[in-house]
């Protein structure tokens, strides 16, 4: 007896983090036996979209011509073959930026910091938010997700770095978000260039030591003042 149909592969082009108003295409790739593809959005009352396969039938395209809040969320896809529906794909989290006004990112005491010293990146929003995200450009996992304790809304989050090494240098941005949808982010802050001087270390960045990498066995997790990292919300953007 045949086992369950293999799960399809789900991905988004140009990526899964999309600015408001931009287009995105979601692809679901199954097998050549597929007769129909279905895209389901988490907690949607009905299938999100259904499409006939593109020749040679092993994938389907789900188009979003203009990204809005409606489309942000967690998706899975399935395909139907003559023997029934497949297993679900691994989830795809589609995040929309531009839902709220941009926060301000600054460095205290200064964006110019000596190796071995401390610096705190401060992300401030005009209106109270309960989630703040710090992005480092070109980091392997460029997102650190910090959520206020008890859902308390705050105007800012602090990202302390100590001791600073050369790998902390680089360009950072931050986002803010409301707890009711972690798939809706603000516009990005203006970039902040953190310059680390006086270091004798190898200046090449090590992704495993990146400030914005999810905490591993060697990493010291960043603890924002009055906030805690919330593992259920930490996401990696490739």
């Amino acid at each position: 007896q045949a086992g369950p149909l293999p799960k399809p592969t789900l991905w988004a082009e140009p990526g899964s983090v999309i600015s408001w108003g931009n287009s995105v295409t979601i692809w679901c790739q199954g097998t050549l036996e597929a007769r129909e593809y279905r895209l389901d959005k988490e907690e949607s009352p009905a299938p999100w979209d259904r499409q006939n396969p593109l020749e040679p039938k092993n994938k389907a395209r789900f188009s979003i011509p203009s990204m809005t809040e409606d489309y942000a969320g967690r998706y899975r896809c399935y395909y139907r073959s003559p023997v029934g529906w497949s297993q679900p794909s691994d989830p795809l989290e589609l995040v929309m930026t531009g839902a709220y006004s941009k926060p301000t990112l600054s460095a205290l005491p200064s964006p110019l910091v000596t190796s071995g010293k401390s610096v705190t990146l401060l992300c401030q929003s005009r209106s109270p938010m309960d989630t703040f995200l710090l992005i480092k450009e070109r980091a392997a996992h460029p997102l650190l997700h910090l959520r206020s304790e008890h859902g308390a809304q705050q105007h800012q989050a602090e990202f302390p770095m100590s001791p600073v090494t050369s790998v902390h240098g680089g360009t950072y941005r931050c986002f803010s978000s409301h707890g009711f949808s972690h798939y809706l982010l603000s516009h990005p802050s203006d970039p902040l260039e953190l310059i680390v001087s006086g270091s004798l270390e190898d200046p090449r960045p090590s992704p495993t030591r990146s400030v914005s990498t999810a905490a591993g066995p060697e990493d010291q997790p960043l603890m924002p003042t009055g906030s805690v990292p919330h593992s259920g919300l930490r996401r990696h953007w490739e």
Partner: antibody, heavy 122, light 109 residues
């Protein structure tokens, strides 16, 4: 044109069972989700249950979970509502309504039947 | 359990713009509630107007539009007609069930 015709209503004693049917025509029934919605005398609408196009997902309002079962037979273009352990407060006109093919295409509750009256009384 | 609240009655004049609203007891109505609007005409004739991803049902005039205004869902009729006199129900989705509002009786005088 799209038509939904409910049947199976009537007068029944508390604690007894009833099965409602909704015969669909004028569209490809197997492509659409379906709902049961009721309206008690002089009251507003109350959604009861919904089922996906292929029957894989079923949803119920808390007050009927375990007592009512929604099902469908796509080969017969028919939607069903099996109602067990009926109570006086289940007295209402029961409507079937069509759902969407998918969320990006169509409007839930776009077409409705004319309703069938269920009276639960001793 | 969530309660969905609508204006019990509204009156407008032909050609005027009228907005009906739909409030959730659980907080702000969001896109995840998939606000839906159903029209009831005399003799219990129900028709879905707007829902899904803000889709308008085929045959529904363009003067009907759905939106989120503040923390509520809204149905706006731009240039009401006498034939728009009806009861309008909104329905909101709560993760695994729908809840209808009590309905708004719209009179077009």
């Amino acid at each position: 044109q799209v038509q939904l015709v409910e049947s199976g209503g009537g007068v029944v004693q508390p604690g007894r069972s009833l099965r409602l049917s909704c015969a669909a025509s004028g569209f490809t029934f197997s492509n659409y989700g379906m709902h049961w919605v009721r309206q008690a005398p002089g009251k507003g609408l109350e959604w009861m249950a919904g089922i996906w196009f292929d029957g894989t997902n079923k949803y119920y309002i808390d007050s009927v979970k375990g007592r009512f079962t929604i099902s469908r037979d796509n080969s017969k273009n028919t939607l069903y509502l099996q109602m067990n352990n009926l109570r006086a407060e289940d007295t209402a006109v029961y409507y079937c309504a069509r759902d969407v093919i998918s969320m990006v295409r169509g409007v839930p509750f776009d077409y409705w039947g004319q309703g069938t009256l269920v009276t639960v009384s001793s | 359990d969530a309660v969905v609240t609508q204006e019990s009655a509204l009156t407008t004049s032909p050609g005027e713009t009228v907005t009906l609203t739909c409030r959730s007891s659980t907080g702000a109505v969001t896109t995840s509630n998939y606000a839906n609007w159903v029209q009831e005409k005399p003799d219990h004739l129900f028709t879905g107007l707007i829902g899904g991803i803000n889709n308008r049902a085929p045959g529904v005039p363009a003067r009907f539009s759905g939106s989120l205004i503040g923390d509520k869902a809204a149905l706006t009729i731009t240039g009401a007609q006498t034939e728009d006199e009806a009861i309008y129900f909104c329905a909101l989705w709560y993760s695994n069930h729908w809840v209808f509002g009590g309905g708004t009786k719209l009179t077009v005088l």
